[in-house]
């Protein structure tokens, strides 16, 4: 503890100028005071002034009023500092002396004589209020007041509580009148060293190092650190815990970058054709009559469907076509004949059969020939049977479709996955991605196709925690940890939903 006992001398009266021994001072009593402060004694005794002592210079002659003086000699009030817990009780002895010598240092002069003394014993609480008193004896009267106050930075009823305002990383506070800490705005805790984070900052996922701040722990983002960060590279997906990639509707794959609904997202089929999804990024367009091409983007000639029969030749017109019929035929499509079997109208060995009592006929064609008069060699490619841009080829009595890369099936209707070719070596896992297949390599291998054997296996040291699976060849660090449910972080080292005091790496 630390405090000051203050004594204010106000007035001293010694009208007759007498000493305690009955003698008078000549020419008058040049008066100074000695003060002794000590622990409480029921009967005041001589001995050390345990709480301190002080002397004044000469303050006046015989009777005088003592003025307040804050510095230099003759300071009033008198100061008696102490460096202990104030006990609340005291004994005080005030002696008035006459000196024939030095005004400023009468204590050192020989021949000093006692004028009078008073003794006060009692209790005194720490406080700013002055206690005023007056003591008389037969010859003299002394008016005075006194109090005990705490030294700077000391507080409490016994001046025992030390408190110094501070504003650094060991505390941000001021001191209350009782010495308790009053935290500065934005700070809390026993020592006012804990910042109050931005209002709403997530308790587990955010923290702060100064007030009104919200710093996100790994795996979280947003102003209040309440939004999880999805897996790096997640394209069309979201997360409910960090590093997840839950795919939006119509998307698939590890990174939700494989389009499972290409038809809806991209509408690739033109001219009213029908689009059918067929796996990641795969689709087939079924064209309306008069259109062809992978996306039905190519309009066919109006004559492409060979509408003219019986050897009629077709001529394209602006919005239609016109059939030029050979002799013996007429009608929009040359479908009506003026010939009979007598005219031998069936070519290529076709057999003629009379109809309608010989007014018309019908040809029965040998294999590989068709047409009303068996005039056409059968072309099995006429119906455009090959999908996805496949080329149709006649092979005698049959036809085959020559498919573009990436398609298969009798009519090239099936989309081949890039992964079907098993491009990943050494047991790597294949993923169909937009720009071709990507391989996830097992431990010990890397490269685009897992063809490179790693001499130093990044997974060998077991860098993944909490039962996570380690993969190499996916990242610059040479390994990636696939976390089990409930764990996050580049090494799956952080459990989800930690208590606020969980230690995080800065």
């Amino acid at each position: 503890g630390s405090g000051i006992f203050q004594l204010r001398l106000q007035e001293f009266v010694n009208q007759r100028g007498m000493l305690a021994n009955g003698q008078s001072c000549e020419p008058g009593c040049r008066t100074f005071f000695r003060i002794c402060l000590k622990h409480f004694q029921a009967t005041f005794s001589e001995g050390p002034c345990t709480f301190g002592n002080v002397s004044t210079p000469v303050l006046g002659t015989n009777s005088f009023v003592v003025r307040d003086k804050n510095s230099g000699s003759g300071r009033n009030p008198l100061q008696l500092p102490f460096n202990f817990t104030w006990p609340g009780t005291f004994s005080l002895n005030i002696q008035a002396w006459h000196t024939p010598g030095d005004d400023l240092r009468p204590e050192t002069s020989p021949g000093n004589s006692l004028i009078s003394q008073i003794i006060i014993q009692g209790s005194l609480a720490v406080g700013k209020i002055w206690r005023t008193d007056e003591q008389n004896d037969t010859l003299t009267r002394l008016s005075y007041s006194y109090r005990v106050i705490c030294s700077d930075n000391y507080y409490g009823e016994s001046c025992s509580r030390l408190c110094k305002k501070r504003d650094d990383h060991f505390g941000h506070y001021e001191c209350q009148p009782d010495g308790s800490l009053s935290c500065l705005p934005g700070w809390t805790g026993k020592y006012c060293d804990q910042p109050i984070c931005l209002s709403g900052c997530h308790e587990q996922n955010g923290y702060c190092s100064k007030p009104d701040e919200c710093i996100c722990r790994p795996g979280w983002q947003g102003r209040l650190c309440n939004e999880c960060i999805p897996h790096n590279g997640c394209r069309h997906g979201t997360c409910s815990i960090p590093w997840q990639c839950a795919c939006d509707e119509g998307w698939g794959g590890l990174f939700c970058d494989q389009d499972l609904n290409y038809c809806t997202h991209h509408s690739p089929c033109k001219n009213g054709s029908t689009c059918s999804n067929s796996g990641p990024k795969g689709y087939t367009c079924t064209c309306l009559p008069g259109y062809t091409g992978e996306h039905c983007e190519l309009g066919l000639s109006k004559c492409a469907s060979n509408p003219c029969r019986n050897g009629g030749s077709c001529k394209d017109q602006e919005n239609s076509y016109h059939c030029l019929c050979p002799p013996g035929y007429y009608g929009q499509h040359c479908e009506h004949s003026t010939l009979t079997c007598a005219d031998s109208p069936c070519f290529n060995g076709g057999s003629c059969r009379e109809r309608n009592q010989g007014s018309s006929y019908a040809c029965e064609c040998p294999p590989n020939f068709t047409g009303s008069n068996c005039e056409k060699k059968v072309d099995r490619c006429t119906s455009n049977p090959c999908a996805n841009g496949g080329q149709c080829q006649n092979r005698g009595p049959s036809r085959t479709c020559r498919c573009r890369p990436g398609f298969t099936g009798t009519h090239c209707e099936l989309h081949i996955s890039d992964c079907a070719r098993s491009p990943c070596a050494h047991g790597g896992t294949c993923h169909d991605l937009e720009n071709g297949p990507v391989c996830t390599c097992p431990a010990g291998f890397s490269g685009r196709r897992c063809e490179v054997r790693i001499t130093h296996d990044a997974c060998a040291s077991g860098p993944c925690f909490n039962g996570a699976t380690c993969y190499t060849g996916l990242s610059p660090n040479n390994f990636v940890c696939n976390c089990p449910y409930g764990f996050v972080g580049s090494r799956c080292e952080f459990p989800v939903g930690l208590p606020p005091s969980f230690p995080w790496v800065a």
Epitope: D152, N153, L162, K164, K165, R166, D167, D168, H169, F170, G171, G189, K190, Y191, D193, Q194, Y207, S209, K210, I215, S501, F502, P503, W504, V505, A506
Partner: antibody, heavy 121, light 104 residues
């Protein structure tokens, strides 16, 4: 009882970076009651405070060294580290790590045994 | 920058009282710690917050701080107290050590 142990190379070439690690045992570095500091003492001279850090990574540096100093913490390993770049012979000193206590008003109540780092080519 | 000044050395006879001063501008408004360092050893905290003793530190070590001066007092000094003593205070966010006093 908490113990602190400095580790790192004892010899560093001029213009290079001095790197030291302090491992804390017998107690968690992740307490809000402490800051973890670095103090150095050139041979035959007095103590100089370098800087400190708490468990969430808030750092404070001596202004005279601030441009060259980085202090970091790894709570998973219960360690904190010092990096001092562009060293000269004047950086030759015994480097101490210490625990500065908030309840003790910032007094450093635990110290490592110190490690001498000499800067010389 | 803030500076703390200590006398280079203080001599004392065994059993007597040694007083080590540490001065700095308005130092009384800051908390002062004192450290003892013996040759070849790490410093040891002997006083914190001006006058508080950590557990295990003998009662003969005491401290005070007012005005511009903090004082470490070793009463009844013993030969084992021979060491270097450093005062330390915090100026804003920076730790500042005194120049050190050798007690013999």
């Amino acid at each position: 009882e908490v113990q602190l142990q400095e580790s790192g190379p004892g010899l560093v070439k001029p213009s290079e970076t001095l790197s030291l690690t302090c491992t804390v045992s017998g107690g968690s570095i992740s307490s809000s009651s402490y800051y973890w500091g670095w103090i150095r003492q050139p041979p035959g001279k007095g103590l100089e405070w370098i800087g400190d850090i708490n468990y969430i990574g808030s750092t404070y540096y001596n202004p005279s060294l601030k441009s060259r100093v980085t202090i970091s913490v790894d709570t998973s390993k219960n360690q904190f580290s010092l990096k001092l770049s562009s060293v000269t012979a004047a950086d030759t000193a015994v480097y101490y790590c210490a625990r500065e206590s908030v309840p003790l008003g910032g007094g450093a109540d635990e110290w490592g045994q110190g490690t001498l780092v000499t800067v010389s080519s | 920058s803030y500076e703390l000044t200590q006398p280079p050395s203080v001599s004392v006879s065994p059993g007597q009282t040694a007083s080590i001063t540490c001065s700095g501008d308005m130092l009384g408004d800051k908390y002062v710690s004192w450290y003892q360092q013996k040759p070849g050893q790490s410093p040891v905290l002997v006083i914190y917050e001006d006058s508080q003793r950590p557990s295990g530190i003998p009662e003969r070590f005491s401290g005070s701080n007012s005005g511009d001066t903090a004082t470490l007092t070793i009463s009844g000094t013993q030969p084992m107290d021979e060491a270097d003593y450093y005062c330390q205070a915090w100026d804003s966010e920076t730790g500042v050590f005194g120049s050190g006093t050798k007690v013999t």
